[in-house]
Amino acid sequence: APVPPGEDSKDVAAPHRQPLTSSERIDKQIRYILDGISALRKETCNKSNMCESSKEALAENNLNLPKMAEKDGCFQSGFNEETCLVKIITGLLEFEVYLEYLQNRFESSEEQARAVQMSTKVLIQFLQKKAKNLDAITTPDPTTNASLLTKLQAQNQWLQDMTTHLILRSFKEFLQSSLRALRQM
């Protein structure tokens, strides 16, 4: 995705046209993705009874979805800006394979699923610009991701529905924690 341009000559004449700050963009980006997830969850919950299911643990064993932990420095107690930013970027990079999996999982919200995926890529770019310690960010191995994707797609229908539900729920929780943390930075 193209990265937004910086200030141009118009900015001098019209102060309101100065580019949004990095924080403003990131905040909008996350709020938009959360809104998209909400729309996708609506379709998932309407289509199946996964949202009320108590058998989540069965499917969760197959997944290694990113989660915020105390050590990541994103919570109010023990908040650490740099550690937290690395965790957010690393987590988003890890979620990318799961967002790819979601691409063929929706009928009426197919475009919305694509928009969530694209918006997440843009968010990662913005956050990488913000991070000082890019070396600490581990990028997932493409081969591992490819085999994970194949494995997820080979699951039976029930497990695929449950996986979709769990990805959306976990991604929502991860983004909500990220948004709270980024607002403190």
Partner: nanobody, 117 residues
Framework: QVKLEESGGGLVQPGGSLRLSCAAS????????MGWYRQAPGKQRELVAD???????MYADSVKGRFTISRDNTKNTVYLQMNSLKPEDTAVYYC???????????WGQGAQVTVSS
């Protein structure tokens, strides 16, 4: 190229109401956040309110309970209903559209709102 056109600004007494509208024309992506920023003379630009295409809203603390943002996706239009206006609401109000799938945005030319007796 997207064009944002504001209307509805003007002079109003304290305690009065105004409704701003902003219509987007051109090839606008339906995945966007439409909103309003304002800038008073000598002050920083600030976000007043915005709304996603799914209807999720965000307001500045200073306008909560007084201003209401809404949108009509079929008309690519965003509205700002401003009630209980105060002199400190005096500013140029700019319509803004943000496209999260690219990170780009568009601005309107602005509508002057003056709250004075």
């Amino acid at each position: 190229q997207v064009k944002l056109e504001e209307s509805g600004g003007g002079l109003v007494q304290p305690g009065g109401s105004l409704r701003l509208s902003c219509a987007a024309s051109g090839s606008i992506s339906r995945f966007n956040i439409m909103g309003w920023y304002r800038q008073a003379p000598g002050k920083q630009r600030e976000l007043v309110a915005d709304i996603t295409n799914g209807g999720t809203t965000m307001y500045a603390d200073s306008v909560k309970g007084r201003f209401t943002i809404s949108r009509d996706n079929t008309k690519n239009t965003v509205y700002l209903q401003m009630n209980s206006l105060k002199p400190e609401d005096t500013a140029v109000y700019y319509c803004h559209t943000y496209y999260p799938t690219t990170g780009f945005d568009d601005w309107g030319q602005g509508a002057q709102v003056t709250v004075s007796s």
